[in-house]
Amino acid sequence: GSVKVLHEPSCFSDYISTSVCQWKMDHPTNCSAELRLSYQLDFMGSENHTCVPENREDSVCVCSMPIDDAVEADVYQLDLWAGQQLLWSGSFQPSKHVKPRTPGNLTVHPNISHTWLLMWTNPYPTENHLHSELTYMVNVSNDNDPEDFKVYNVTYMGPTLRLAASTLKSGASYSARVRAWAQTYNSTWSDWSPSTTWLNYYE
């Protein structure tokens, strides 16, 4: 039977090394066996690359494409193939579809004056455009009370958050996670970091 795309590819870039495209077929598909996504920078003399997709679900395919040293004006031509049949053709501008990398190494340290110091790492090297563009959202939740949670927006440069222990329940176990957003690129939010857990206490 004929192969058809139900939901056309949606793509995001981490704006440093990788772009990811995801699409849905109209029936369960072995993505890696049946499909190929070709991509090429829209410039004379650019290489034509091929991405082998993987299954995310029965009929959902995802392709991770190495994309080197992205610059704002870059546009990629994308072509989705099933053998010799062109299923879909489109273009993708990484700078217009940024999903930042996930912040890393979230840790919690006791600090002076009954505060907790939450620290994490900026996922971009200093020379990358996004390094100085990121703002963060920190989610702090009580492990035993789903209604007890707080969201903090960190809009200053440093990847840190000071949290007064008194704003949390004493003796309760809390978990924190962090995600990033690049305002000037109108990005989507990054994935959440892995959670880190600690026991809150104060006198």
Epitope: F43, M44, G45, V71
Partner: antibody
Framework: EVQLVESGGDLVKPAGSLRLSCTVS????????VHWVRQAPGKGLEWLGM???????DYNSVVKGRFTISRDNAKNTVYLQMNSLRAEDTAMYYC???????????WGQGTLVTVSS | DIVMTQTPLSLSVSPGEPASISCRAS??????LNWYLQKAGQSPRLLIY???RLQSGVPDRFSGSGSGTDFTLRIGRVEAEDAGIYFC?????????FGQGTRLEVR
């Protein structure tokens, strides 16, 4: 860090042969094309040819048939094999990496080839 | 092959003054025009690609314009470190071809 380093330049007699090497680091030869460009003493730049990431090659007609570009991915090295050399091939030979629109964003330091009897 | 012609072949500019170099292609090359600077004893360095896009790390006193067959490189305020030979290169068609070069002296 992206780097290209040429080697193999030498004094060679007319009609002789020479193989130049361009060893790269900081990028993959399967994803970027590499070009050879030469510059005769006190003169301008002349494009000789390129090897694409996929392995195919293109040449300038002035050297086609005499010069051959190849590569060894395992050694991260691109080669320029030069045969039937002439006095007018005397030049500094550069390898360079392709960027957007056939722009050459990283160049080696060059290796000098002198063809003289 | 596409012939690239640069003018002037040399110019002398005082620090802080502007400078301009023209490059003409023998046929339409759209916006596929790149500029390089080669300082004495060094390899060429990419300054501008695709007519007007500044290569990473290049000071914004450099700018490029044009399309089709006529292109211009401008330096807003020349500095001593800008001395060298400037080459234009067409990137529309193989073989790639370069202009003959323009020597900029900063006096």
């Amino acid at each position: 860090e992206v780097q290209l380093v040429e080697s193999g330049g030498d004094l060679v007699k007319p009609a002789g042969s020479l193989r130049l090497s361009c060893t790269v680091s900081g990028f993959s030869l399967s994803r970027y094309s590499v070009h050879w460009v030469r510059q005769a003493p006190g003169k301008g730049l002349e494009w000789l040819g390129m090897i694409w990431g996929g392995g195919s090659t293109d040449y300038n007609s002035v050297v086609k048939g005499r010069f051959t570009i190849s590569r060894d991915n395992a050694k991260n090295t691109v080669y320029l094999q030069m045969n039937s050399l002439r006095a007018e091939d005397t030049a500094m030979y550069y390898c360079a990496r392709t960027y957007r629109g056939y722009a050459l964003d990283y160049w080696g330091q060059g290796t000098l080839v002198t063809v003289s009897s | 092959d596409i012939v690239m012609t640069q003018t002037p072949l040399s110019l002398s500019v005082s620090p802080g003054e502007p400078a301009s170099i023209s490059c003409r292609a023998s046929q339409d090359i759209s916006n596929y025009l790149n500029w390089y600077l080669q300082k004495a004893g060094q390899s060429p360095r990419l300054l501008i690609y695709y007519t007007s896009r500044l290569q990473s790390g290049v000071p914004d006193r450099f700018s490029g314009s044009g399309s089709g067959t006529d292109f211009t490189l401008r330096i807003g305020r020349v500095e001593a470190e800008d001395a060298g030979i400037y080459f234009c290169q067409q990137a529309n068609t193989l073989p790639l071809t370069f202009g003959q070069g323009t020597r900029l002296e900063v006096r």
